[in-house]
Interface confidence: medium
Amino acid sequence: MDERLSLLRSPPPPSARHRAHPPQRPASSGGAHTLVNHGYAEPAAGRELPPDMTVVPGDHLLEPEVADGGGAPPQGGCGGGGCDRYEPLPPSLPAAGEQDCCGERVVINISGLRFETQLKTLCQFPETLLGDPKRRMRYFDPLRNEYFFDRNRPSFDAILYYYQSGGRIRRPVNVPIDIFSEEIRFYQLGEEAMEKFREDEGFLREEERPLPRRDFQRQVWLLFEYPESSGPARGIAIVSVLVILISIVIFCLETLPEFRDEKDYPASTSQDSFEAAGNSTSGSRAGASSFSDPFFVVETLCIIWFSFELLVRFFACPSKATFSRNIMNLIDIVAIIPYFITLGTELAERQGNGQQAMSLAILRVIRLVRVFRIFKLSRHSKGLQILGQTLKASMRELGLLIFFLFIGVILFSSAVYFAEADDPTSGFSSIPDAFWWAVVTMTTVGYGDMHPVTIGGKIVGSLCAIAGVLTIALPVPVIVSNFNYFYHRETEGEEQSQYMHVGSCQHLSSSAEELRKARSNSTLSKSEYMVIEEGGMNHSAFPQTPFKTGNSTATCTTNNNPNSCVNIKKIFTDV
């Protein structure tokens, strides 16, 4: 690229900024478009109107969007049409000066390929690189009277279409996702455009969660919910993981024969032993459920920790309703309920002179529920979170898999039943009996506890295995692709969730090392000055404008304290 064009990278010196240019027609290269332009330099784009002005037709009030115009050489701030430093009017308030907004044409040179458009097209999005006169000014080439960008050519068709279509973003098929997203970033189309693009490409939108308003509450919430926010928070996370692991180890160990509680795990399934188990004190754990039992003590300590953690997090959380709906918190509740039910039945038994307070079957189910506390680990494990997200995103495919399996099971269990019907030694006494065999065969597990003995049965079995391989394999690539997406999203730095405060909220950025408080340092263009004045009364004309950060959008209109929002994607302890 020649020296002159390379100078366009930095803003021109003040002397060069406002050189007047006579209308000119640059030489077109190849099939490039030509320019018919009245190329005057402009004053810097004006700021939008202050926050005290609204437009009532016929009223002698300055409309918000009509601020002063101005900007780079062959364009202005498009005062009348909203192309200035101030926020554009909301759709409900049409721009009174729309007709003034830059009917003149402008040439944009993308690495030698010229595009021609009207300024009013660009003016629609004053917060973008091309829509803001000042931002685009640094790329203006006064000699050729055009804007020069050393950027990806194929992408620009879509970038220009974004302006022409009023905000539709479509990636050209010949442009890779990563290159196109970089172009969106470069042309500063904004987070909304990036979100639309990501959604169209199948990325999942991330939501934000508010942080508690009160400082103490917020500190506690960060301590228990965001392990990376501080040293103590990391310590609590480690303790929590250890307690979960101890609890699971206890759950498993207490079923070993030498530790087994005969009441809940009878040696035989005879009716006698069930009845005897009601008040049995035999076995190596005589009175195993007594409160002095080591397993019970450890279990109690674990439950105390789980309960403490749950209650603290409940009282510190910013929204009780959201907290109650969170699957992770429901798992936490499920993890502690069995203990209290068991404790309740134990106490009831003691008061009722050893009479069993609850059926053993129910008791066993309740005890089984304790195993779900292993899912508590997913709060601290990136791996489990990815697995959970993958399964959630792949529900349709999993449903498809189960549906295929269901059809196959019905089909092949019927077939094998009739194929084996004549053989008295066959284990397929009914179609429902054959369901198990069909599942085991289709999934290619093949236990061998049931197997066909006739030629016909073996043929059916072969077909069943082949059909299983084919049908089960079909949805797997989609699930794997989902897993890859979530896995790479976590590992390629996107776990840097942003704590952010909207409006008056300051940004808090959180990295994998720590969450640090940071002042909001977004560069705000003048185009966002916005005010309304009506009959002497001042009031805001616009709804709260969300700040957009990272690849997420947060709005917190409910409060004005710093740090009031947090990206829902949490920081994880790597497991």
Partner: antibody, heavy 116, light 113 residues
Framework: QVQLQESGGGLVQPGGSLRLSCAAS????????MSWVRQAPGKEVEWVSS????????NYRDSVKGRFTISRDNVKNTLYLQMNSLKPEDTAFYHC?????????WGQGTQVTVSS | DIQMTQSPSSVTASVGEKVTINCKSS????????????LNWYQQRPGQSPRLLIY???TQELGIPDRFSGSGSTTDFTLTISSVQPEDAAVYYC?????????FGSGTRLEIK
Amino acid sequence: QVQLQESGGGLVQPGGSLRLSCAASGFTFSINGMSWVRQAPGKEVEWVSSINSGGEITNYRDSVKGRFTISRDNVKNTLYLQMNSLKPEDTAFYHCVTGIVAYDYWGQGTQVTVSS
Amino acid sequence: DIQMTQSPSSVTASVGEKVTINCKSSQSVVSASNQKSYLNWYQQRPGQSPRLLIYYASTQELGIPDRFSGSGSTTDFTLTISSVQPEDAAVYYCQQAYSAPYNFGSGTRLEIK
């Protein structure tokens, strides 16, 4: 380069009238909001009036409302301020500026003196 | 009306020194809609018209040297010149852009020793 050239100032008696003009060049006048700002010698700067790019929306400071009228001619690239019922306190240098609430470019100003 | 009070009324500094000029508005100039402070800073050199230095309380106008910076929020604002240069001798004005009339402060004269 951007140029704003004011004219039409002078000495006038209280109650008299003046019409200030501002010839704009070096930028696309028709798409820029414009304002008048005044500065009396040794006194602070005062915003007087603003007009949007199309000329259909105007705004004035209370002390001049009803007496001053801001207007523009986008064909001639000229901004006007018609000042009637002038008072001694209107004495100042009147600057034509680009912008409505933040002023990028300023003319050198024209002196208006209201005195008997 | 929102009144703007500037302090000090004048300040003398040597080349290379740091200078801060304060501006206080009689009421908040932060927009509820976008949380931005509607405050501008201007420089007026002797015999010249004012020029815009800072808008939105802290955003530098294009072509303004980096030594000029603005800060503050709600009602209290500061213009800082990190290392004063001889050409910075001027009167500095703050102006609220929140609601009409868009009043200016009384100005702070900066003189260079």
